[in-house]
Amino acid sequence: QGWQAFKNDATEIIPELGEYPEPPPELENNKTMNRAENGGRPPHHPFETKDVSEYSCRELHFTRYVTDGQCRSAKPVTELVCSGQCGPARLLPNAIGRGKWWRPSGPDFRCIPDRYRAQRVQLLCPGGAAPRARKVRLVASCKCKRLTRFHNQSELKDFGPEAARPQKGRKPRPRARGAKANQAELENAY
């Protein structure tokens, strides 16, 4: 019941390579680097995009007062609200990580709370009543998690580095065509 907005600002979560699809280890023959028409542009982070805000999972910081009936916290608390788009949705040649990114549609990721923290707040009540202490659970960080075909949207799957392991018993194909052939080894990561 009682949350009064006080102020807010935003922080981008720039994904780390351990959390998101990583570029393949060998990039010498990567045509993204070597194509003349691209001016030999260097390899990009797989989720890098000119408009980061369009595709990043953002942490919006809200500073609020906690209220409980007539009582209000002595000091405001700062909480995060998770917002924004989770990739991958960028120009194809730089999306060299795992996953079948050449498809027109693919795994759906959502920006949702990752970690929570508990904070004790002191509530001041009117009419000279004694202050009350209360614990509130606040969002501490946000993360991109995948909607899976086996769960509903409330049960989201972590998109972490463990997803990079190739399917059990599957032989990696030879790297016949440079870095992009690495896609074959990682194509079942989703």
């Epitope: 045509k31 991958p88 949705a89 960028r90 194809l92 990114w101 050449w102 795994p107 052939a181 194509e187």
Partner: antibody, heavy 119, light 112 residues
Framework: EVQLVESGGGLVQPGRSLRLSCAAS????????LHWVRQAPGKGLEWVSG????????DYADSVKGRFTISRDNAKNSLYLQMNSLRVEDTALYYC????????????WGQGTTVTVSS | QSVLTQPPSASGTPGQRVTISCSGS????????VNWYQQLPGTAPKLLIY???QRPSGVPDRFSGSKSGTSASLAISGLQSEDEADYYC????????????FGGGTKLTVLG
């Protein structure tokens, strides 16, 4: 101007083969994944096949698997669809389409070429 | 029979807001992003919405997409006569080896 132009359609008997081509211009060809989508007369859209930057990045619809082969020639800015063992139900307008963005929909389309399979 | 289910028709008058639904399953809409296409009479399809709710440049903000669970919807506000077209939803389907599946299409008629 970004453009995809399909060719190679025509009238063919069941069981025969046909090869469709799609010529691209106005963009960096191998920045795009490319697809074939068909539309039977008076019906909806049906995805046929798609190919990424290279030949090991290929998908087919179940209805054409084993009969159709998609390929691309980046040097010629061209996409192909080799259609074998054609059936009457393959009769449709075949569109060439591309996506420049991973999981970002088909954002470039050609005007289509008509394939009629009839005896 | 299409894997994704859309109403065959929808209608509205100029200025109205119209919503087109698209129903799927856990193997397609439930776990993958949804795209929407517009096909004007006698022309090739055009991408309208990608990744559930993103508009390509040049698409008016009258068009918006949303997704919840195994269903998606396309909303068109401030309906205009030039919006009369067929609309298709599409998503990757993870069944078997997978394929890109379209809805059967919805013919939108702008009345009056």
């Amino acid at each position: 101007e970004v453009q995809l132009v399909e060719s190679g359609g025509g009238l063919v008997q069941p069981g025969r083969s046909l090869r469709l081509s799609c010529a691209a211009s106005g963009f960096t060809f191998d920045d795009y994944a490319l697809h074939w989508v068909r539309q039977a007369p008076g019906k909806g859209l049906e995805w046929v096949s798609g190919i990424g930057w290279e030949d090991d990045m290929i998908d087919y619809a179940d209805s054409v698997k084993g009969r159709f082969t998609i390929s691309r020639d980046n040097a010629k800015n061209s996409l192909y669809l080799q259609m074998n063992s054609l059936r009457v139900e393959d009769t449709a307008l075949y569109y060439c389409a591309g996506n420049s963005r991973g999981y970002g929909g088909l954002d470039v389309w050609g005007q289509g070429t008509t394939v009629t399979v009839s005896s | 029979q299409s894997v994704l289910t859309q109403p065959p028709s929808a209608s509205g008058t100029p200025g109205q807001r119209v919503t087109i639904s698209c129903s799927g399953s856990s193997s397609n809409i439930g776990g993958n992003t949804v795209n929407w296409y517009q096909q004007l009479p006698g022309t090739a399809p055009k991408l309208l919405i990608y990744s559930n709710n993103q508009r390509p440049s040049g698409v008016p903000d009258r068009f918006s997409g949303s997704k919840s669970g195994t269903s998606a919807s396309l909303a068109i506000s401030g309906l205009q006569s030039e919006d009369e077209a067929d609309y298709y939803c599409a998503a990757w389907d993870d069944s078997l080896e997978g394929s890109y599946v379209f809805g059967g299409g919805t013919k939108l008629t702008v009345l009056g």
